[in-house]
């Protein structure tokens, strides 16, 4: 139509100045399009610059409606984590408070002259709880054999106890039971409290991770050309108003995203293993009943060891032989009276309750974000059209939008009418961030089924992706060298956030 | 064989810092307490504090609280102990020591690092 | 802080001889105290813990004895190499403190 060719370009000069561009590259009137290389070329109010522009533009657009997007579920993870994180230290802390309030009281000498024991323990249990490559167990069963060698010393100030006499005790303590079942339940109890606490949360800094990193995941040219097509070409050809047809853009979109995508069926189970695992926070092995609870056992533990002590000695001395005996020391140190006991099973706040049903529906609703995400982003950022179909921009004019729409992931997109996409190279990083979520995903179902796991040799998968296994801080990335259990007892390994402790010593 | 290396002597201006290493090897790094102790010239030995070496957790004497920082590399199995605001006095001998079993009684000793204060 | 208070600071005495140090803490230590030798030069090494267990590689002529306050270390027959400074210390309360030391000199 020769009149077309007069047309003005006054609505994309409007729109191209809005953007930050120099007004100096717009033509008065419509030119001739043969040298677009995206848009079809009619004629057109856009120069190879104005199109490289916008190119640019939308491709950046895009990535920052993306980031948005994940922000968004990012800033929820990380509350999440924020929340349960502090609800879990702050149970370990209060029974640590409460142990270093009652114990001196209770149990006197026999806890102030081994608190730095005590204090190590529950160091042990935060580092464990945040991730670090330590076994548990072996944690417990160390901290059982230096305070049995200790207070076996303190009870018998008058034997004389060599190294080869301690020795020979710790080889002793496991047929001798000198703290009675406490130590077998607590072991039993908070290997399961704690692996499902530190893999729920771990679980959260995994997904809150994997999102990070696949949100920085470039998009590549055959995306940039569609997304111009998409959304600027319509200004250039002289139909600034029409809006892009529903299904063209989610085609653009299920194109561009299509590697994305293909972490959903992993995502789903990430999320479903997550909710699963909080039924492990109730009952009586339960990690609000647990975790808060350690000193009780411990008490337990120490009462048993004074209950027991004459036939224990006795055992002992027929295992090792008779101790020499100080002549300057006293008689058997005298039988305190028990320590009294706080009650075990502690009353649940209400906090968890109100955490994991928040946490479950806030799970549930990300759940479908990487299918969804296509969809969420074309009906929130690209301003689609609600016009009739044959009134929206479908990539080459106004008009009704033909091709089907593609299914999800990236073998989907082998016949995808916008983007070219290359189905037998997929992208890397999202692969390695699959392969991360299966880890996780595995971790937690060990998780559920009361194991221990090894967290920093699980996630060796060899991808090298850096991605983060989750971990709170540093910990995990630090393999703490452990020596086998043996009688001479290794310290445990103590947290730094407690340090400089002044007062008694416990040596 | 348990053996603890300490760096060499060192000459500091009053007002300087001074960071001494010991290097451990022939045991578990991470499974005892080191120590810190100081000997002045002619005088007997002072506890500045102690360091778990799996994780940094410090305990220290209050008399060195304000200036002293303990710490440790595990990959390296060393651990270090920076004196700030230097002074006169803490002319000395400084020693690392390693607890002998959990007991607080040092068993292995470094050799010493002379630290000497002047102007 | 627990003090401890060594006497006598130092001791003139000839090979052969028997000498005891005594070690006096300001208040109740139980057993936890080490004794350590120092020659000249050296590091400390360590004697004695618990109060009265010698340590390996410590000649069977020292021996520790004592509980609570007062302890002693006692050289049954000084020898030319335990002509050095001798140190108790407590490990019962931090800050860990050391004796001021006993000099066992060549009479």
């Known amino acids: 139509d020769p009149a077309s060719k007069s047309r003005s370009c006054g609505e994309v000069r409007q729109i191209y100045g809005a953007k930050g561009f120099s007004l100096s590259d717009v033509p008065q009137a419509e030119i001739s399009g043969e040298h677009l290389r995206i848009c079809p070329q009619g004629y057109t109010c856009c120069t190879s610059e104005m199109e490289e522009n916008l190119a640019n533009r939308s491709h950046a657009e895009l990535e920052t409606a993306l980031r948005d997007s994940s922000r968004v579920l990012q800033a929820m993870l990380a509350t999440q984590l924020r929340s349960f994180d502090d609800h879990f230290q702050h149970l370990l802390n209060d029974s640590e408070r409460t142990l270093q309030a009652t114990f001196p009281g209770a149990f006197g000498e026999l806890y102030t002259q081994n608190a730095r024991a005590f204090r190590d323990l529950y160091s042990e249990l935060r580092l464990y709880y945040r991730g670090a490559n330590l076994h548990l167990e072996e944690t417990l069963a160390e901290f059982w054999a230096r305070l049995l060698e200790r207070l076996f010393k303190q009870l018998h100030p008058q034997l004389l106890l060599p190294d080869d006499y301690l020795d020979c005790l710790g080889k002793q303590a496991e047929a001798l039971r000198p703290f009675g079942e406490a130590p077998r339940e607590l072991r039993l109890r908070a290997t399961r409290a704690f692996v499902a606490a530190r893999s729920f949360v771990q679980g959260l800094g995994v997904a809150s991770d994997v999102v990070r990193k696949v949100a920085q995941v470039p998009l590549g040219p055959e995306c940039s050309r569609a997304v111009m097509k998409l959304v600027y070409c319509a200004h250039c050809l002289g139909v600034p108003g029409a809006r892009p047809c529903p299904d063209y853009c989610r085609n653009v979109l299920k194109g561009c995203l299509a590697n994305q995508a293909d972490l959903d069926a992993e995502w789903r189970n990430l999320l479903d293993s997550m909710v699963l695992i909080t039924d492990k926070f109730w009952g009586t092995s339960g990690v609000e009943s647990v975790i808060g609870s350690v000193h009780t056992w411990l008490a337990e533990a120490i009462n048993a060891l004074q209950d027991n002590r004459d036939t224990l000695t006795a055992k002992v001395i027929q295992g090792c032989g008779n101790p020499k005996v100080n002549p300057q020391g006293p008689g058997p140190e005298e039988k305190r009276r028990r320590g009294k006991l706080a009650p075990r099973e502690r009353p649940p706040s209400g906090t968890l309750e109100k955490l994991v049903s928040e946490a479950k529906a806030q799970l549930r609703d990300v759940q479908d974000f990487w299918i969804s995400l296509p969809g969420t982003l074309c009906s929130e950022k690209m301003a689609l059209s609600t016009a009739s179909d044959d009134r929206c921009w479908n990539g080459m004019a106004r008009g009704r939008y033909l091709p089907e729409v593609m299914g999800d992931g990236l073998a989907n997109q082998i016949n995808n009418p916008e983007v070219e996409v290359d189905i037998t190279k997929p992208d890397m990083t999202i692969r390695q961030q699959i392969m991360q979520l299966k880890i996780m995903t595995n971790r937690l179902r060990s998780a559920y089924n009361g194991n221990d796991v090894d967290f920093q040799d699980a996630s060796d998968d060899g991808s090298g992706s850096g991605s983060g296994d989750g971990c709170l801080d540093d910990l995990c990335s630090r393999k703490v060298s452990r020596k086998s259990s043996s009688s001479r007892t290794p310290l445990t390994h103590a947290l730094p956030g407690l340090s400089e402790q002044e007062g008694q010593k416990t040596s | 064989q348990v053996q603890l290396v300490q760096s060499g002597a060192e000459v500091k201006k009053p007002g300087a810092s001074v960071k001494v290493s010991c290097k451990a090897s022939g045991y578990t790094f991470t499974g005892y307490y080191m120590h810190w102790v100081r000997q002045a010239p002619g005088q007997g030995l002072e506890w500045m504090g102690e360091i778990n070496p799996s994780t940094g957790d410090t305990t220290y004497n209050q008399k060195f609280k304000a200036r002293v920082t303990m710490t440790r590399d595990t990959s390296t199995s060393t651990v270090y102990m920076e004196l700030s605001s230097l002074r006169s006095e803490d002319t000395a001998v400084y020693y690392c020591?390693?607890?002998?079993?959990?007991?607080?009684?040092?068993?292995?000793w470094g050799q010493g690092t002379l630290v000497t204060v002047s102007s | 802080d627990i003090v401890m208070t060594q006497s006598p600071s130092s001791v003139s005495a000839s090979v052969g001889d028997r000498v005891s140090i005594t070690c006096r803490a300001s208040?109740?230590?139980?057993?936890?105290l080490a004794w350590y030798q120092q020659i000249p030069g050296k590091a400390p090494r360590i004697l004695i813990s618990s109060a009265s267990i010698l340590q390996s590689g410590a000649p069977s002529r020292f021996s520790g004895s004592g509980f609570g306050t007062d302890f002693t270390l006692t050289i049954s027959s000084v020898q030319p190499e335990d002509f050095a400074t001798y140190y108790c210390q407590q490990a019962k309360s931090y800050p860990l403190t050391f004796g001021g030391g006993t000099k066992v000199e060549i009479k």
């Open positions: 020591a390693r607890e002998k079993r959990d007991d607080g009684v040092f068993a292995y």
């Open positions: 208040e109740h230590i139980n057993g936890w």
